[in-house]
């Protein structure tokens, strides 16, 4: 039985040319967690973070993605192509998969905040 | 040049032990998750263990979980896999293989058989 | 588990011929797949990771391409060396699985 809650970012917004960290953790299961994808508004993977083998990042995105902090991902030199949905898919022993979503919406003006409902400092 | 040289391999009678070590050279060892892949003969790959790089954190298949344990030393660049409760099915070619398999050894075969 | 199933199983071409080799997976895994060439008696050798991205020092005769649960691995003009068996590996959840393996020898 899965018992085990993702919180995430939730819906968030940064500046054009800024970064922004897109974060989720799973909560409420002792669950172990073997791998964590994160997938793209068109579905295709950014980076997988296996608990063994660390951070492997698909090649188009090694130049804007940093790995972390922890389980996240940090997307840097933002356009607005990014904006739209992210995906965070924790594969989990006995668990299964749990998935949390995030909106990213980045904005030309000068006055957007990355505001967030959850953060891991 | 990256180097993984397994060794230990050897025959061993059903429910009898070994111990696989792989040396690894040419890298910073302590900075990559290390794997154990086997090949049983005339078969496909099966993955075995993986290590986390500073071997904290361990992964089992399903059939290997309680008789053997992946572990490493990375004062000594080395990979070790410990198979006790050897069984007919473990024989195989064993190969030790760096991060998500980019550099695989030459192999150390395991022949269990009475 | 996911299992990756390949074919053909073996295959017998001509040099210079395409050849085509294809693996699919029992759910989608994106493009989270690898390649690999295992010549008679030595250890696999990464080919393609991600799908479609060549590991260095590969030649660019090989091409992989697919995503989701349909990909394939391309020899454009098959050379005597390329003698070999390869196998495709998800590597989208754990535990990570291999295909069965293709063996392709030269007609």
């Known amino acids: 039985m899965m018992t085990g809650t993702i919180e995430t970012t939730g819906n968030i917004s940064a500046k054009k040319g800024g970064s922004v960290i897109l974060q989720c953790h799973l909560s409420s299961t002792m669950a172990q967690v073997t791998q964590v994808n994160w997938e793209q508004h068109d579905h295709s993977l950014l980076a997988i973070r296996n608990a063994e083998l660390g951070w492997h990042i698909y090649p188009a995105f090694k130049d804007r993605v940093a790995p972390g902090p922890g389980l996240g991902l940090t997307l840097q030199s933002l356009t607005m192509n990014d904006t739209g949905e992210y995906f965070c898919t924790y594969h989990t022993y006995p668990d299964g998969t749990y998935r949390g979503r995030i909106f990213l919406e980045v904005l030309e003006s000068s006055v957007a905040e990355h505001s967030a409902r959850f953060q891991i400092p | 040049e990256v180097q993984l040289v397994e060794s230990g391999g050897g025959l061993v009678q059903p429910g009898g032990s070994l111990r696989l070590s792989c040396a690894a050279s040419?890298?910073?060892?302590?900075?990559?998750?290390m794997s154990w892949v086997r090949q049983a003969p005339g078969k496909g790959l099966e993955l075995v263990a993986t290590?986390?790089?500073?071997?904290?954190?361990?992964n089992l298949a399903d059939s290997v979980k309680g008789r053997f344990t992946i572990s490493r030393d990375n004062s000594k660049n080395t990979l070790y896999l410990q198979m006790n409760s050897l069984r007919a099915e473990d024989t195989a070619v064993y190969y030790c293989v760096r991060g998500y398999f980019d550099y695989w050894g030459q192999g150390t075969t395991v022949t269990v058989s009475s | 588990d996911i299992q990756m199933t390949q074919s053909p199983s073996s295959l017998s071409a001509s040099v210079g011929d395409r050849v085509t080799i294809t693996c699919r997976a029992s759910q989608d895994i994106k493009t989270a797949l690898a390649w690999y060439q295992q010549k008679p008696g030595k250890s696999p050798k990464l080919l393609i990771y991600w799908a479609s991205t060549r590991q260095s020092g590969v030649p660019s005769r090989f091409s992989g391409s697919g995503s989701g649960t349909d990909f394939t691995l391309t020899i454009s003009s098959l050379q005597p060396e390329d003698v070999a068996t390869y196998y495709c590996q998800q590597y989208y959840s754990t535990p990570y699985t291999f295909g069965g393996g293709t063996k392709v020898e030269i007609k």
């Open positions: 040419g890298f910073t060892f302590s900075s990559y998750g």
């Open positions: 290590i986390k790089s500073s071997g904290g954190s361990t």
